[in-house]
Structures are given as structure tokens and as C-alpha cells.
């Protein structure tokens, strides 16, 4: 009689996580009598997956009825496959004995598990960065298999190139993780911008997963300041206006100083949003010229989002014909937390001088 062959027809089988895997095995002869056992891996550390003769294997069933007369089909079905089931499975014939003696192994079938990546999670910088600076965003996705995966970054639909991506682990594993960092240059127009991390994998049937982050969480757009004087009123009062424009986020404190002394402090709140997501705020101060013998130096001091204060000064001339005169001073951190009245108007898109 010819020698018994243990035939595992498939070299490899690929199964989606959650599905069942069928591992085929037939023997070429009824001789010798003895059971079939299935193992994952080879050598002394191999793991018993199924033993027709004895044991409890709740996830494994024989494809053919083992009591069928002259049965030579010892294929098995493993239910509810997870990435941890990946490996090479061997169908091994034993000769009946006390104990049964291993006789011959099949060539093995490699089971690979297709597992979907988790939804990408995008995280931005811990603290806001000022426009015109570069910040890093990270994207992570886990639990996928096989290892091949594609990750792309987009900002407002345009693919980013300053990207570094790693898939771990480097060697063989039941499942993998990807971590990618994208460096994004912030512009003043980015309050409404979005970065998207897009992950494509064989398990997703061409429908990639996306994770998003809003640049509004990461950006700070510093304000432009302009101080102007309205014409003198009949009652000898001058209306001086401080226009604070194009800033984000809204957290802003404005302090008026008269000749270096705090006159009023205001906090921005409930401002209307510009189309680009920034805010404007206008504050004014009435100065009674007749109460002053000398020129009055007015300073509009703005502290935005916890950053060092920005000042813009203006001198009101106490003379028969007041002349407008604006000058920038170095930033001074002289604002107070004293609250004052808050009047504002939306005066968008004027040309302003910008001072940090």
C-alpha cells in the first residue's frame, strides 16, 4: 500500500475578523487507523487547536461528520476569527496507540486575518500657536491586519507633504498600529480650516476611514489695532476709537490708559463672527479736552489669549485746533482685570497697522 499523505490543499487562507475560517485537510488512506489533530505552529511550542479524539474546542467544528463511515476529510471550521488566530495551522495524523503516536503532518495552511483599522484619532498641539507658525498634528489607528496600509493628510482638501508615518511593530504580528505626524503651517485664514487624516486598508473596500481636527483648536490669530480720533464735539469732548480686528480666539481684554493711568478695562464677549472665523471689536473713549492743560496721551492696550499685551497710543492735542497724531509704543504689560463697559461694532476688512 502506498504511504499515507496528509493533504492541506491551501497554502494560505485569508479571513475577515469576525468571520469563520475553513481549514481543509484530507488524508489519502484509511490506513493506519488513528485520529487527526490540528495544531497552530510547529515544534514543541505548538498549540493544540482541535483533537477529534478528545477535548473541548468550542470555536472549532469538524466540517465532515467524523462518525461518517470511511471518513477521510478532517477539515475544520473555526468561528469568530480574531487577529489573535493568525498563524500556520497543521493537520497532523496520529497512529492509534497508547498513547497515539504522531505519524505525519500536512504542509500547513497559513491563516491571515483581515482586521479593520480603528477609526483614526487626530490630535493637535496642546497649546495654541500663532498664525504663521508650524504645528504638529498626530493621527493614530490600531488593530489592523495585514500590515499594508496607506495614510494621507489633507488640509482643506489639499494633500500635505510634511508627514512622518510609522507602522508598528516592524516584524510579524497579529495586528498593527499606525501613527503619523503632519506639520502644518498656520495662516491667518485658517480659523475655519480642517485637517483630515485618511486611512486606506484592504479591509475597507475602497472606502477609507477619516479622522478630523479643526485648526480653530490650535490657532491663535493676533489682532490688528488702530486708534483714531473723531472730530471734536461741541461740548469739548473728543471721541477716540480703538479698533481691534481680525483676532481669534475671542478671549481678549482691552485697557484704556490716559497718560499712563488706567482709565477703563473691558473684556470681549459675545462678539459676532467674521466670515473667516475671526472677531472684531471697537472700543471708544470720550476725553474731555477742557479738563486738561496739556496734551493727553491715550493708549489702547490689548491682551489677547494670554499673550503679552499690544499697545497703540494716540495723543490728543489740547489747543484751539486739535490735530490727529498716532504713534506706536513698545508693548507694555500694564492692563488690569478691572471691568468696564463694553461697546462694540463690527467694522470688518479695513486696512490696519499691525503691531505685536
Amino acid at each position: 500500500e502506498e504511504e499515507l499523505q496528509v493533504i492541506q490543499p491551501e497554502k494560505s487562507v485569508s479571513v475577515a475578523a469576525g468571520d469563520s475560517a475553513t481549514l481543509n485537510c484530507t488524508v489519502s488512506s484509511l490506513i493506519p487507523v488513528g485520529p487527526i489533530q490540528w495544531f497552530r505552529g510547529a515544534g514543541p511550542g505548538r498549540e493544540l487547536i482541535y483533537n477529534l479524539k478528545e477535548g473541548h474546542f468550542p470555536r472549532v467544528t469538524a466540517v465532515s461528520d467524523p462518525t461518517k463511515r470511511n471518513n477521510m476529510d478532517f477539515s475544520i471550521r473555526i468561528s469568530n476569527i480574531t487577529p489573535a488566530d493568525a498563524g500556520t495551522y497543521y493537520c497532523v495524523k496520529f497512529r492509534k496507540g497508547s498513547p497515539d503516536v504522531e505519524l505525519k503532518s500536512g504542509a500547513g495552511t497559513e491563516l491571515s486575518v483581515r482586521a479593520k483599522p480603528s477609526a483614526p484619532v487626530v490630535s493637535g498641539p496642546a497649546v495654541r500657536a500663532t498664525a504663521e507658525h508650524t504645528v504638529s498634528f498626530t493621527c493614530e489607528s490600531h488593530g489592523f491586519s495585514p500590515r499594508d496600509i496607506t495614510l494621507k493628510w489633507f488640509k482643506n482638501g489639499n494633500e500635505l507633504s510634511d508627514v512622518q508615518t510609522n507602522v508598528d511593530p516592524a516584524g510579524k504580528s497579529v495586528s498593527y498600529s499606525i501613527r503619523s505626524t503632519a506639520r502644518v503651517l498656520l495662516t491667518r485664514r485658517d480659523v475655519h480650516s480642517q485637517v483630515i487624516c485618511e486611512v486606506a486598508h484592504v479591509t475597507l473596500q475602497g472606502d477609507p476611514l477619516r479622522g478630523t481636527a479643526n485648526l480653530s483648536e490650535a490657532i491663535r490669530v493676533p489682532p490688528f489695532l488702530e486708534v483714531t480720533q473723531q472730530s471734536m464735539r461741541a461740548d469739548n469732548q473728543v471721541n477716540v476709537t480703538c479698533q481691534v480686528t481680525k483676532f481669534y480666539p475671542q478671549r481678549l481684554q482691552l485697557t484704556w490708559l490716559e497718560n499712563g493711568n488706567v482709565s477703563r478695562t473691558e473684556m470681549a464677549s459675545a462678539l459676532p463672527e467674521n466670515k473667516d472665523g475671526t472677531y472684531n471689536w471697537t472700543s471708544w473713549l470720550l476725553v474731555n479736552v477742557s479738563a486738561h492743560r496739556d496734551d493727553v496721551k491715550l493708549t489702547c492696550q490689548v491682551e489677547h489669549d494670554g499673550q503679552p499685551a499690544v499697545n497703540k497710543s494716540f495723543s490728543v492735542k489740547v489747543s484751539a485746533h486739535p490735530k490727529e497724531q498716532g504713534s506706536n509704543t513698545a508693548a507694555e504689560n500694564t492692563g488690569t482685570n478691572e471691568r468696564g463697559s463694553s461697546d462694540y461694532k463690527d467694522d470688518d476688512d479695513k486696512h490696519h497697522h499691525h503691531h505685536h
Epitope: E1, L30, I31, V33, G34, P35, N51, L52, K53, E54, G55, A62, D65, P66, T67, K68, R69, N70, N71, K96
Partner: antibody, heavy 119, light 110 residues
Framework: QVQLVQSGAEVKKPGASVKVSCKAS????????INWVRQAPGQGLEWIAM????????HYNQIFKDRATLTTDTSTSTAYMELRSLRSDDTAVYYC????????????WGRGTLVTVSS | DIVLTQSPDSLAVSLGERATINCRAS??????????IFWYQQKPGQPPKLLIY???NLDSGVPDRFSGSGSGTDFTLTISSLQAEDVAVYYC????????FGQGTKLEIK
């Protein structure tokens, strides 16, 4: 290792019934056929029937079809053979045997249960 | 039903000599290249023990002085060199259809 442990000897009157048990261990009970064979004193082996514990499929020797019933209890891995309308010529040792190769052969045997039918 | 007839009914052989027991089926017990004949040994007060399966294959733990041969309807169990512990009754059984046994052959030492 495979073991088949049978119930103890029985003495029955003609016309009565007997139920012999066979408790299996050392293997997965539902994966192998159980055969029942009897041997009258000084006589040869006589095949009675076989049962597949996984689905209770049975095959009977025509001689016993009307009087013998095979059952199993998979929760206890026990096979049973009931023989009704006993006659004196049913006096025999009754064996259970496991078919390890699904060849309708008898690889492992119990030690036998003597059933004596006598008035 | 297939009827198996063993011959002889009893046999006496000297220690160390060859013993041969025959089993003839009333019709062929061969199918798909296999011969569905099995041989058993039964010693007094013990259950039978499988010796040979599918006509010519030694069961595990059976000494290699035992061998089986034959095909179709005629089969033979041979003990090449009889040992004292081989004294027993030998049965053939077929499973081409539902099983039946031969009537048995009693082997003794001459």
C-alpha cells in the same frame, strides 16, 4: 486512554427487559460509534447494533430490530442497550465496543455484562 | 447478509510453528480499494481484542508475528511462530455492509 465501563451482571425472568449501560471516557463520546455485541456461553460473537452518539443514528441486526433499543446520554458519555421480551437463549455476556476508525470495526471493548435469563 | 465462514473450527499447532486461519465471505467485502475484514483474538474470560484491520494492517501494540492477507472473498490470519500466549479463539468480522462475525476458530498448542 479510552475506557468503556459497563454496568454489573443482571438476572432477569423470561419476558422481562434489561438495560445495560456503558460509560465512556478518555475520548470525545460524540465522535465515535458505539457497537453492542453479545456472546452466549461457549458460543461465538453476535453483533446486535450500533449507534452514533452525535445524532443517535442507529443500525440494527435484523434479528434484534424489534427487541433491542440503543440510546445515549451525551451529558454523561453513556450508551445504553435495552433488550425486551427476554428469553432463556438471551443469556449471554453483552459487550459495548467503540469504533475508533469509523470503519464499523470494534477497536476498544468494555469488559462485558453478564445477563442471565432464568425462571 | 454477508456470511463469514472460518476454517478450521479448531486448530492445534506446536510452539514456534506457523498457524493459519482462513475466513471466506459469501460475497466480496472489498470496496474502493479496501478489504473490509477485521481479525480479533479472544482469550477466556476477556473481551475480544482487535488484531488486524482492513485485512492486512496490524493494530497498535500487536506483535508482528501476526499478519493478515487476502482480498475479495478469501482472507487469512497467520501467526508466523506460535507463542503460548497466542492460545485463544480468533474471529473474523466484515464491515462491507452491517457487521457480522465468523463462527470463530479455537487455536491450541499441540
Amino acid at each position: 486512554q479510552v475506557q468503556l465501563v459497563q454496568s454489573g451482571a443482571e438476572v432477569k425472568k423470561p419476558g422481562a427487559s434489561v438495560k445495560v449501560s456503558c460509560k465512556a471516557s478518555g475520548y470525545t463520546f460524540t465522535n465515535y460509534w458505539i457497537n453492542w455485541v453479545r456472546q452466549a456461553p461457549g458460543q461465538g460473537l453476535e453483533w446486535i447494533a450500533m449507534i452514533d452518539p452525535s445524532d443517535s443514528e442507529t443500525h440494527y441486526n435484523q434479528i434484534f430490530k424489534d427487541r433491542a433499543t440503543l440510546t445515549t446520554d451525551t451529558s454523561t458519555s453513556t450508551a445504553y442497550m435495552e433488550l425486551r421480551s427476554l428469553r432463556s437463549d438471551d443469556t449471554a455476556v453483552y459487550y459495548c465496543a467503540m469504533d475508533y476508525g469509523s470503519l464499523y470495526a470494534m477497536d476498544y471493548w468494555g469488559r462485558g455484562t453478564l445477563v442471565t435469563v432464568s425462571s | 447478509d454477508i456470511v463469514l465462514t472460518q476454517s478450521p473450527d479448531s486448530l492445534a499447532v506446536s510452539l514456534g510453528e506457523r498457524a493459519t486461519i482462513n475466513c471466506r465471505a459469501s460475497k466480496s467485502v472489498s470496496s474502493s480499494g479496501y478489504n473490509y475484514i477485521f481479525w480479533y483474538q479472544q482469550k477466556p474470560g476477556q473481551p475480544p481484542k482487535l488484531l488486524i484491520y482492513l485485512a492486512s494492517n496490524l493494530d497498535s501494540g500487536v506483535p508482528d508475528r501476526f499478519s493478515g492477507s487476502g482480498s475479495g472473498t478469501d482472507f487469512t490470519l497467520t501467526i508466523s511462530s506460535l507463542q503460548a500466549e497466542d492460545v485463544a479463539v480468533y474471529y473474523c468480522q466484515h464491515s462491507r455492509e452491517l457487521p457480522t462475525f465468523g463462527q470463530g476458530t479455537k487455536l491450541e498448542i499441540k
